[in-house]
Every structure is written in structure tokens, then in C-alpha cells.
């Protein structure tokens, strides 16, 4: 019941985390720049890590997809690069679990097969998490080493004056929300792990051995207790009865009333 | 670089009309607001009006209801008519924007001018 409960758990705590990996990879609010008040009217500006905006005060809103931008920098390539593989392991670890789920009854299926499915996708869900907490991070450590804060400049060319303004780059919603999404998916994937242990089948130190007996008459040869106990030398429970005794592996079974287990 | 031209300017009668044009240039990836400043000899620069990229627009109490502005967002374009042009509308006509650069990213802003247009009134 409680591995039914942590796998259904960590299943949920996923989910959630990965509906918000893939928010935050959407969002346009990866950074935000300081509102500045021009005279015509209060603009402010944020970035995403496929388009920006423009926000005014009136409440118009534009924004412009990174196409026409000459050059993108490799490590906003690589925040894309981790966010996206983090969505995609976490929807394949997504449909796996559902398929794994101890809840869900898929033909005969047997425990063993789910809980290495279960821990398939819990390993899925920690590298879908620490993808876009890497990415979040990188982003992050992006904004607080290179662009924190614009010089504000002043030059004079052909055409005027060109002065830059001075914005502040300050960490936006997309990346607190793609942190938090990043734990849950990872906390998830634990659970998942966590859940494989109980799903598994305890291997026990010896096999089962069924005697089957050929005639109507059994004898049993001395050190039977050893061979089937596994506390003699014969600990691989290879066959040592002439009289049909054979291991759970090899055995078929046929119905007779001469059957003894 | 990125670039403001102004044309339209010369000598025109009181009661006249005239029309400015500014033209943005360069590797511009968006323009926020653009605007209109003119400064008269011995005075200060001022706003005379401005577009945001929305549509919002403003104006100077002296030139309300005299001067319209309006921009091609296509052609990345600002315009200015001017119409009952006074004496005291006199001066050396700036165009200003708050524009993206194309050339970095995250997008860097930047408040760009032009190297002005005289507009003279005079009888």
C-alpha cells in the first residue's frame, strides 16, 4: 500500500514538475529590465529565451521573436538545448510511469517488469529535473556575470547622438518557476526510485523445488533436507533425484494425485 | 550602427503646413517610443510630441491641436504634420527613439537621436 502511495505520489509530483518545466521554457519572463519612464510614456522590457516584449503602461504589449537578432550567444543556445531535453525525457518518463503505476493493471504484466519500469522513469525524472535546474542556473549566472547591469554609454555618429539607456537586468518569473518545477520533477523521480524497492520482488538466498514423484512409490535419498534448503553443496539446485525432483525453473506441471510439494 | 535622418525642414510662412519625416536605420530590432524634440536658439530642448509603439501618443500644450504624429512601423518611420505653423514654432527639429539594437543579446536599448532639422516661420 505505501509503495502504491509513493509511486503514485512521486507520478503527481512529477507531472507537476514537468507542466512547469515546459511553462517556464514558454514564458517570456526569464529577465525583466527595470521600468524606465520615457516622457511619451512608461515602458517596460522582458526576455524570454525565444522572444522579447515590450510593455507599456497603456497596457500594450509587443513582442518580437530572436530571428532577426545577428547573433545569439551559445550559452542561450545551450539554456534551450537543457531545457528542451529536460521536457522531452520528462514526457517519455511520463509515459512510462503511467504504464508502471501499480494502480494500473496492463495484461499480465508482472511486478518485476513494472518496477524497472518504475525506476526507468524515476531516472528520467531526476535528469529531466537537474536538466532545468541546470538551465535555469545557467541562465541565472548569465544575467548576474555578463548583463546585470548596461553601461550607459554615450556616442556620436553620423546620424546624432546615440546614448544606451541604462536598464538593470533583474531575474524574472520564468526562473523561479522553472527551479521550483525543476525540484518537483526531481523530488518525483525519488520517489520513483523509492517506489522501485518496494515494486521488486524479494530474491530470496534459495529456490523453491517441487518433487515430482514417477511412480507410486517416492524415495527420498539421504541429504534431500540439504539439496532443497540450499544449506549443502548443492546450492545451484541441480537435479539429484533420479525419482523426478527438478528445480521451479525446469518444472511442468501436470496434475496428479501422486503431486508432492 | 543605428541611425536617425530627419528631412522635411526649411522655411515656410506663418498659417503654412509642413511635413517632417525621420527615418530609423541600421540593425534595429524594435523601436518602443519614438518622438519629436526641437530647440529654439537660447532655450532649452523640449518635447514637442511622441509615439509609442502601441499607438499612445503625446503632445506639448503649445502644438495641441496643430501638430499630428504618426509612425510606419514597417518602415520604421516617424512623421510630423504641422499645420497653422507659428513664429514661435521656429527651431531645429530632433527626432529621439527608444529602440532595440539587433545586435546582442539579451536586446540592449538604446535612446537615439538625429542630427536635427531646421524648420524656420517667418513672414
Known amino acids: 500500500m505505501a509503495v502504491t502511495a509513493c509511486q503514485g505520489l512521486g507520478f503527481v509530483v512529477s507531472l507537476i514538475g514537468i507542466a512547469g518545466i515546459i511553462a517556464a521554457t514558454c514564458m517570456d519572463q526569464w529577465s525583466t529590465q527595470d521600468l524606465y519612464n520615457n516622457p511619451v510614456t512608461a515602458v517596460f522590457n522582458y526576455q524570454g529565451l525565444w522572444r522579447s516584449c515590450v510593455r507599456e503602461s497603456s497596457g500594450f504589449t509587443e513582442c518580437r521573436g530572436y530571428f532577426t537578432l545577428l547573433g545569439l550567444p551559445a550559452m542561450l543556445q545551450a539554456v534551450r538545448a537543457l531545457m528542451i531535453v529536460g521536457i522531452v525525457l520528462g514526457a517519455i518518463g511520463l509515459l512510462v510511469s503511467i504504464f508502471a503505476l501499480k494502480c494500473i493493471r496492463i495484461g499480465s504484466m508482472e511486478d518485476s517488469a513494472k518496477a524497472n519500469m518504475t525506476l526507468t522513469s524515476g531516472i528520467m525524472f531526476i535528469v529531466s529535473g537537474l536538466c532545468a535546474i541546470a538551465g535555469v542556473s545557467v541562465f541565472a549566472n548569465m544575467l548576474v556575470t555578463n548583463f546585470w547591469m548596461s553601461t550607459a554609454n554615450m556616442y556620436t555618429g553620423m546620424g546624432g547622438m546615440v546614448q544606451t539607456v541604462q536598464t538593470r537586468y533583474t531575474f524574472g518569473a520564468a526562473l523561479f518557476v522553472g527551479w521550483v518545477a525543476g525540484g518537483l520533477t526531481l523530488i518525483g523521480g525519488v520517489m520513483m526510485c523509492i517506489a522501485c524497492r518496494g515494486l521488486a520482488p524479494e530474491e530470496t538466498n534459495y529456490k523453491a523445488v517441487s518433487y515430482h514423484a514417477s511412480g507410486h512409490s517416492v524415495a527420498y535419498k539421504p541429504g534431500g533436507f540439504k539439496a532443497s534448503t540450499g544449506f549443502g553443496s548443492n546450492t545451484k539446485n541441480k537435479k539429484i533425484y533420479d525419482g523426478g525432483a527438478r528445480t521451479e525453473d525446469e518444472v511442468q506441471s501436470y496434475p496428479s494425485k501422486h503431486d508432492y510439494v | 550602427e543605428v541611425q536617425l535622418v530627419e528631412s522635411g525642414g526649411g522655411l515656410v510662412q506663418p498659417g503654412g503646413s509642413l511635413r517632417l519625416s525621420c527615418a530609423a536605420s541600421?540593425?534595429?530590432?524594435?523601436?518602443?517610443?519614438m518622438s519629436w524634440y526641437r530647440q529654439a536658439p537660447g532655450k532649452q530642448r523640449e518635447l514637442v510630441a511622441g509615439i509609442s509603439a502601441g499607438g499612445t501618443t503625446r503632445y506639448a500644450d503649445s502644438v495641441k491641436g496643430r501638430f499630428t504624429i504618426s509612425r510606419d512601423n514597417a518602415k520604421n518611420t516617424l512623421y510630423l504634420q504641422m499645420n497653422s505653423l507659428r513664429a514661435e514654432d521656429t527651431a531645429v527639429y530632433y527626432c529621439n527613439a527608444d529602440l532595440a539594437e539587433a545586435t546582442s543579446w539579451p536586446v540592449r536599448y538604446l535612446e537615439v537621436w538625429g542630427q536635427g532639422t531646421l524648420v524656420t516661420v517667418s513672414s
Open positions: 541600421g540593425s534595429i530590432f524594435s523601436i518602443n517610443v
